[in-house]
């Protein structure tokens, strides 16, 4: 079964090595999740040809997936640590419902999908400890999430494949942007 960073023998600190700092732990955690997304994308891409499609061809969808923008303060230009951290946490909280949707979408990578979901929850906790301005973080309404989940699960097979692909790609991009920003903090 997939393990969280720190649980496998390779990640256990050697007797004389320094324990991971909070930033290093977060960095390692994001890289672990990205590896998981890569594995899930492989299964998705083997099932359909959507991975070859350009972004424009897939842009017309009703999903409101979190996305980094200049105003969020996470880019090199206009970088703002506090604003960016709030965006990362808020975005991850918004992705949670989509990660729940992914849970029944994989056959051979079912455990990997669960590991991505669980380690994202842990990542949110790590980041919340790091954030100063927790009041600015908005948590999605459970009822809104429940109805969105129902709606996504009611789609036809082709749309569900498309949704799966878009969620994985958007989540990957969001995490990569987050990692770049966190490495500047």
């Amino acid at each position: 079964a997939p393990v969280l960073p720190g649980e496998d023998s390779k990640d256990v600190a050697a007797p004389h090595s320094q324990p991971l700092t909070s930033s290093e732990r977060i960095d390692k955690h994001i890289r672990y999740i990205l590896d998981g997304i890569s594995a899930l994308r492989k299964e998705t891409c083997n099932r359909s040809n959507m991975c070859e499609s350009s972004k424009e061809a897939l842009a017309e969808n009703n999903l409101n997936l979190p996305k980094m923008a200049e105003k969020d303060g996470c880019f090199q230009s206009g970088f703002n640590e506090d604003t960016c951290l709030v965006k990362i946490i808020t975005g991850l909280l918004e992705f949670e419902v989509y990660l729940e949707y992914l849970q029944n979408r994989f056959e051979s990578s079912e455990e990997q999908a669960r590991a991505v979901q669980m380690s994202t929850k842990v990542l949110i906790q790590f980041l919340q400890k790091k954030a100063k301005n927790l009041d600015a973080i908005t948590t999605p309404e459970p009822t809104t999430n429940a109805s969105l989940l129902t709606k996504l699960q009611a789609q036809n097979q082709w749309l569900q494949d498309m949704t799966t692909h878009l969620i994985l790609r958007s989540f990957k991009e969001f995490l990569q942007s987050s990692l770049r920003a966190l490495r500047q903090m």
Epitope: E52, S53, S54, K55, C74, F75, Q76, Q176, R183
Partner: antibody
Framework: EVQLVESGGGLVQPGGSLRLSCAAS????????VTWVRQAPGKGLEWVGI???????AYATSAIGRFTISRDNSKNTLYLQMNSLRAEDTAVYYC??????????????WGQGTLVTVSS | AIQMTQSPSSLSASVGDRVTITCQAS??????LSWYQQKPGKAPKLLIY???TLASGVPSRFSGSGSGTDFTLTISSLQPDDFATYYC????????????FGGGTKVEIK
């Protein structure tokens, strides 16, 4: 065939501007990170800047405020707008693609380069 | 800002020699380092990424090792086609840096 082709290089006066193009064929540019790297005559490689999938950009300190990377997905082309050019910007400019499947930047497909000469 | 220091800047070697080039980062970059080969008048070619993973089509005589701040590119038995300039490149962070590449190592015929 999967390839990148740069164009737009030439002779420009100090203080002038130039726009380089990088045309992609055989793949959709919007799915990848693309970077610009330059090489002054007889010198080593110097990273200039990168554009990520989300149109996020990052630049080397020498390029900040003077150079801008953008793309036109409908033309499958990347651009490097260079302003306030100096003699030390004289170099062969390469565009290169990163497959963006991971978090670290690595460039596995390169164009042939275009020469920019800044001189009066 | 992360800086990459490569050494030596040049070396002379014979066909069949074992060649080692080192690259040092000014701070830890995990294993997020690539190696490139460049021949005169040509674009660079990716040899190794993630410090030790061979890029597609690269001969197995090339190998990479290291993690954190210290990295090595080794050519186990130098071939005529290997005389070129080699560059390391950090892919850890491309923000607020002067250059992502090391200064290069020119491998010449002895």
């Amino acid at each position: 065939e999967v390839q990148l082709v740069e164009s737009g290089g030439g002779l420009v006066q100090p203080g002038g501007s130039l726009r380089l193009s990088c045309a992609a064929s055989g793949f959709s540019l919007s799915n990848y990170y693309v970077t610009w790297v330059r090489q002054a005559p007889g010198k080593g490689l110097e990273w200039v800047g990168i554009i990520y999938g989300s149109d996020e950009t990052a630049y080397a300190t020498s390029a900040i405020g003077r150079f801008t990377i953008s793309r036109d997905n409908s033309k499958n082309t990347l651009y490097l707008q260079m302003n306030s050019l100096r003699a030390e910007d004289t170099a062969v400019y390469y565009c290169a693609r990163d497959d963006s499947s991971d978090w670290d930047a690595k460039f596995n497909l390169w164009g042939q380069g275009t020469l920019v000469t800044v001189s009066s | 800002a992360i800086q990459m220091t490569q050494s030596p800047s040049s070396l002379s070697a014979s066909v069949g020699d074992r060649v080692t080039i080192t690259c040092q980062a000014s701070q830890s970059i995990n294993n997020e380092l690539s190696w490139y080969q460049q021949k005169p008048g040509k674009a660079p070619k990716l040899l190794i990424y993630r410090a030790s993973t061979l890029a597609s089509g690269v001969p197995s005589r090339f190998s990479g090792s290291g993690s954190g701040t210290d990295f090595t590119l080794t050519i186990s038995s130098l071939q005529p086609d290997d005389f070129a300039t080699y560059y390391c490149q950090q892919g850890y962070s491309l923000r607020n840096i002067d250059n992502a590449f090391g200064g290069g190592t020119k491998v010449e015929i002895k």
